[in-house]
Interface confidence: low
């Protein structure tokens, strides 16, 4: 004979647990129905009546099967440096992620609590490690023979052009200037751009970074004049 189907509320066998989407109500000492996502318990069960569920009100939600007396409040609206990647509905909280050019400096269970602008490497410094969703750009001084003349969160140090005759030698922040009109460098001129991080949970393919001398620490510091050795800007 098939096992008898028990309808909620029912008293569980000693030592057994309630079934999926049921909970044990300690007051009634019965297994009772949980409320579905998007609902909450309006009236708790008794020995003779099951849980009465009701829909969550506007701007509140429950994400799981539950028996909470009130739905949870959705988080506050996304700030100007964020984009709303998931709206507040009766079944899910609002999720805010950082907009392009920013990274998440303080995350929360889902989404981001505090976004900060990606560091920009100053002239003489290039990107050693690109920014991601959750980490800032790391800058490094351009090594001898390379330069960066931009303030950028994506540009890396590029090799100096090789001149037949050098008019002005290159340095960390300036390319060499040739007297000849035909430099021998085979690389195409112009800045090399790294891909901007996107605010989704995608895989980032990144070049292997060199050891960095510019740690990512300045996102909350007030922006005053800073020594050139730091190699980054806050704007």
């Amino acid at each position: 004979l098939p096992a008898q189907v028990a309808f909620t509320p029912y008293a569980p066998e000693p030592g057994s647990t309630c079934r999926l989407r049921e909970y044990y109500d300690q007051t009634a000492q019965m297994c009772c129905s949980k409320c579905s996502p998007g609902q909450h318990a309006k009236v708790f069960c008794t020995k003779t009546s099951d849980t009465v569920c009701d829909s969550c009100e506007d701007s509140t939600y429950t994400q799981l099967w539950n028996w909470v007396p009130e739905c949870l409040s959705c988080g506050s609206r996304c700030s100007s440096d964020q984009v709303e990647t998931q709206a507040c509905t009766r079944e899910q909280n609002r999720i805010c992620t950082c907009r392009p050019g920013w990274y998440c400096a303080l995350s929360k269970q889902e989404g981001c609590r505090l976004c900060a602008p990606l560091r920009k490497c100053r002239p003489g410094f290039g990107v050693a490690r690109p920014g991601t969703e959750t980490s800032d750009v790391v800058c490094k001084p351009c090594a001898p023979g390379t330069f960066s003349n931009t303030t950028s969160s994506t540009d890396i140090c590029r090799p100096h052009q090789i001149c037949n005759v050098v008019a002005i030698p290159g340095n960390a922040s300036m390319d060499a200037v040739c007297t000849s009109t035909s430099p021998t460098r085979s690389m195409a001129p112009g800045a090399v751009h790294l891909p901007q991080p996107v605010s989704t949970r995608s895989q980032h393919t990144q070049p292997t970074p060199e050891p960095s001398t510019a740690p990512s620490t300045s996102f909350l510091l007030p922006m005053g004049p800073s020594p050139p050795a730091e190699g980054s800007t806050g704007d």
Epitope: Q26, Q63, L64, N66, W67, P69
Partner: nanobody, 124 residues
Framework: QLRLVESGGGLVQPGGSLRLSCAAS????????MGWLRQAPGKEREGISC????????YNADSVEGRFTISRDNAKNTVYLEMASLQPEDTAVYYC?????????????????WGKGTLVTVSS
């Protein structure tokens, strides 16, 4: 398989302390409220402490407020109950239980998984 295993119970003198542990397996603590309940001989089971899975907020029954502290270590998938200033009326079998994501009060209001319990005896 979902399991909760309590440990740390035993005999303690009045005024003494104990730390109960509840090791969870088969699920991650992050997404559930966890609670401690107790049942004294000849009495109904009562909820005494709950910790929420959503934000870690805690709730205690009046009878243990200021003496018992519930905590969790998600990395170890374990819930703890620190019990201080124990009195003979705290003698009971202590059960660990799982609720949904949220607590509402010390009793969880219900539970869907619970352990077999650990006996705490307070006596001189």
């Amino acid at each position: 398989q979902l399991r909760l295993v309590e440990s740390g119970g035993g005999l303690v003198q009045p005024g003494g302390s104990l730390r109960l542990s509840c090791a969870a397996s088969g699920f991650s603590l992050d997404y559930y409220s966890m609670g401690w309940l107790r049942q004294a001989p000849g009495k109904e089971r009562e909820g005494i402490s709950c910790i929420s899975g959503s934000d870690g907020s805690t709730y205690n029954a009046d009878s243990v407020e200021g003496r018992f502290t519930i905590s969790r270590d998600n990395a170890k998938n374990t819930v703890y109950l620190e019990m201080a200033s124990l009195q003979p009326e705290d003698t009971a079998v202590y059960y660990c239980a799982r609720g949904t994501l949220y607590c509402f009060g010390p009793s969880l209001g219900g539970m869907d998984v619970w352990g077999k319990g650990t006996l705490v005896t307070v006596s001189s």
